[in-house]
Interface confidence: low
Amino acid sequence: MMTGTIETTGNISAEKGGSIILQCHLSSTTAQVTQVNWEQQDQLLAICNADLGWHISPSFKDRVAPGPGLGLTLQSLTVNDTGEYFCIYHTYPDGTYTGRIFLEVLESSVAEHGARFQIP
């Protein structure tokens, strides 16, 4: 039975040209995290594997940095970065937990962070 909960940074916004940290946290489970995938819609951005460490998609390696922790830092943001991002936790023995973050990249200098929310 999957008892865990993923907390994410929720709906967030940032300025064009700036940086943003995508964060997820898995709680309420003793399951072992074997791998975390970060995906943007249908694209795999990065993998953090418990054995092998981080691997950033070479298509994004100039703009994506691993961390902090199991999070992901997006740099040099463009309006094309607006959209859904998913953290996918592969765990044993629970299985897969998925968290969703929506990022809006704004042209203006007004970029406010949304509230945190939980996905059971």
């Epitope: 791998q35 795999l44 092998l52 460490g53 691997h55 390696k61």
Partner: nanobody, 117 residues
Amino acid sequence: EVQLVESGGGLVQPGGSLRLSCAASGFTFDRSWMGWFRQAPGKEREWVASVLRGGYAWYADSVKGRFTISADNSKNTAYLQMSSLKPEDTAVYYCAREGSGYASDYWGQGTLVTVSS
């Protein structure tokens, strides 16, 4: 001793297909990223594709939809299936073991792929 040996290159007509193989030894294959790179005459070596156990694969935009990378852990072999080949795919193709963070630490000797009519 780590060894990577590529094979499968050759001359192929535009629109044709080839499958490259990379036989690996001397390290734990199923706990490693494997990548394919290529170097065209007079150009720098460029990344083509990477694969991790479990089938996670990434591709350069120039080959997406035409090339497929895979790995057979039981044979310690990585493959690059190339289809709809174009003259600009002509290059020496190398396989490499990639460490964490996309740094390739071991390379094969390369296999030449020539796409020409």
